[in-house]
């Protein structure tokens, strides 16, 4: 497909098209992951994700289906990405017994201090509560070691899940997660539906939350959510993340429940102006002559910094890589070393529109 | 195709109530919400809230909020919104809307909309 | 989040370039659509994302604009493109609207 050919000024310098000599005509570009579903797709709506929702595509490069957390036990940590599966965890006030991959096969709820013990350290997902004695001198509670054990998963009487506490405030809206990954509010402090796919979790104390209609009998607790691709920003708006589907751009981390996806430089570009959450230039990786010192840096986080050259010389770096291989993406601190009189300014091409977003990120929201 | 069919129109007291139904067909309905949206006569397009088909969970605009319920029934794919304590201000034209499906993003604007339905709030 | 659409009502020829405007009261980034509307009728989606065209509407009909100030553009008014054409934007809950444009024959 003409779109694997190298990143270079096509279609009137615009990073987002590519010129198709076949059908004669400017094309867009299919963001990476995405697939076209026609030869010269013309807009977003052209292009589709690789898999079909709820599934992504695993290192053999097939659809594998992402786990579900539709258990009432469950709430979902990470959602269904395109490159990864589906992370659930137990849900607040309970925690894992038996582990499983990107799930938890049994949970528990967190066991209730008896009389004369104290919490030393809170239950979690994956911990259950460890109790300590109250004061120094032996309590009536530990007068055998017995009582003294942490108490066995499965045989606690006393357990009782986390309260659910109520929303106060009233804020103007107070959306569910809806379109292909619907999910039924599993926040911290509430319960969750055991009918819903996949779940995104809100705090029930946020601010500007307004309590809803009562749900259906046994659907949970409706609290806050956002439609996909939405987030709950720090004053409870849902409010849209940023999107990656600039051809230079790649998705560094999801759209989550309570922060925006994040967007980073594909492979073989490096960031050459920055913006929160994403990059608002990219330019491709340079290639430094012999007197520039490439410097290893740690291999998980896959970056590597320029030193440069003793005083006096003179760094040649060409634009693009002259033997074709892409090394991988770089941090925008590295960029300024490449690039330290980038422009601050976005070019705005009028067939793929870059914006700041109210918080400062470069949007392109072009699907 | 999506389609949205909704009810017919409604002439209603003030302080009564009145409930729009629609009918989704076309595509998997617990898929995606259902918004509500009105146009009074002369006046801007207004959000209302919509409704998640999968979970029953209902969200709100806070100038509804209290009067407005929005409810699904998954059996017949249908979803239903009801105002009451109605007020000749609330004479309008009420749509239930669907958002687009495209690609690798999902954004709420909406592709698909309801014929739409008139209620008519008059004594 | 206000839209404030300009003008409010248009009269004009076909043929005649037609702009209509929609200012965010913030920043909304791209996160705008644009709507046809006529009479008795739903509203039907020309533009998303501030300037990408629905499939299947003519390229006479293009949108620009990002951060508080969008625009849609009709390049050559056509008979059937006499109707009223408002812009939401979808970047933050609740969900808004702009009062709407009435594109008349001159």
């Known amino acids: 497909f003409p779109q694997d050919r190298p990143f270079e000024d096509t279609c009137h310098g615009n990073p987002s098209h590519y010129y198709d000599k076949a059908v004669r005509r400017c094309c867009y570009r299919c963001p990476m992951g995405l697939f076209p579903t026609q030869q010269c797709p013309q807009r977003p709506t052209d292009c589709r994700k690789q898999c079909e929702p709820d599934y992504y595509l695993d290192e053999a490069d097939r659809c594998t289906a992402c786990v579900t957390c539709s258990r009432d036990d469950l709430v979902e940590k990470t959602p269904c990405a395109w490159n990864s599966s589906r992370v659930c965890e137990c849900r607040p006030g309970m925690f894992c017994s038996t582990s499983a991959v990107n799930s938890c096969a049994r949970c528990f709820f967190h066991s209730v201090c008896p009389a004369g013990m104290i919490v030393k350290f809170p239950g979690t997902a994956q911990k259950n509560t460890v109790c300590e004695p109250a004061s120094p001198g032996v309590s009536p509670a530990c007068a055998s070691p017995e009582n003294c054990k942490e108490p066995s998963s499965g045989t606690i009487p006393q357990a009782k899940p986390t309260p659910v506490s109520p929303a106060t405030s009233s804020a103007s809206t107070m959306p569910v997660r809806g379109g292909t990954r619907l999910a039924q509010e599993a926040a911290s402090k509430l319960t969750r539906a055991p009918d819903s796919p996949s779940s995104v979790g809100r705090p029930s104390s946020d601010p500007g939350l307004s309590p809803t209609q009562p749900c259906p009998e046994g659907s949970g607790d409706c609290r806050k959510q956002c439609e996909p691709d939405y987030y709950l920003d720090e004053a409870g708006r849902c409010t849209a993340c940023v999107s990656c589907s600039r051809d230079d751009l790649v998705e560094k981390t999801p759209c989550a429940w309570n922060s925006s996806r994040t967007c980073e430089c594909r492979p073989g570009m490096i960031c050459a102006t920055s913006a929160t959450n994403s990059c608002a230039r990219c330019v491709p990786y340079p290639i430094c002559a012999a007197e520039t010192v490439t410097k290893p840096q740690d291999m998980a986080e896959k970056d590597t910094t320029f030193e440069a050259p003793p005083l006096g010389t003179q760094p040649d770096c060409n634009p693009t890589p002259e033997n074709g291989e892409a090394p991988a993406s770089t941090s925008p601190t590295q960029s300024l070393l490449v690039d330290s009189q980038a422009s601050k300014t976005l070019p705005i091409p009028t067939s793929a529109p870059v914006a700041l977003s109210s918080t400062g990120k470069p949007v392109l929201d072009a699907g | 195709q999506v389609q949205l069919v909704q009810s017919g129109s409604e002439l209603k007291k003030p302080g009564a109530s009145v409930k729009v139904s629609c009918k989704a067909s076309?595509?998997?309905?617990?898929?995606?919400?259902i918004h509500w949206v009105r146009r009074p006569p002369g006046k801007d397009l207004e959000w209302i809230g919509y409704?998640?088909?999968?979970?029953?969970?209902?969200d709100y605009n806070q100038n509804f909020q209290g009067r407005v319920t929005i409810t699904a029934d998954k059996s017949t794919s249908t979803a239903y919104m009801e105002l009451s304590s109605l007020r000749s201000e609330d004479t309008a034209v009420y749509y239930c809307?669907?958002?687009?499906?495209?690609?690798?993003?999902?954004?709420?604007?909406?592709?698909?909309w309801g014929q739409g339905t008139t209620v008519t709030v008059s004594s | 989040i206000e839209l404030t659409q300009s003008p409010s009502f248009l009269s004009a020829s076909v043929g005649d370039r037609v702009t209509v405007t929609c200012k965010a009261s913030?920043?909304?980034?791209?996160?705008v659509a644009w709507f046809q509307q006529k009479p008795g009728k739903a509203p039907k989606v020309l533009i998303y994302?501030?300037?990408y065209r629905e499939s299947g509407v003519p390229d006479r009909f293009t949108g620009s604009g990002s951060g508080t100030d969008f625009t849609l553009t009709i390049s050559s008014l056509q008979p059937e493109d006499f109707a009223e054409y408002f812009c939401?934007?979808?970047?933050?809950?609740?969900?808004?609207f702009g009062g709407g444009t009435k594109v008349e024959i001159k």
């Open positions: 809307a669907r958002r687009a499906d495209y690609g690798n993003y999902e954004y709420t604007w909406f592709a698909y």
């Open positions: 076309g595509y998997t309905f617990t898929t995606y919400t």
């Open positions: 409704i998640n088909p999968s979970s029953g969970c209902s």
């Open positions: 913030q920043n909304v980034g791209t996160n």
């Open positions: 994302s501030a300037s």
């Open positions: 939401q934007q979808y970047h933050t809950y609740p969900l808004t």
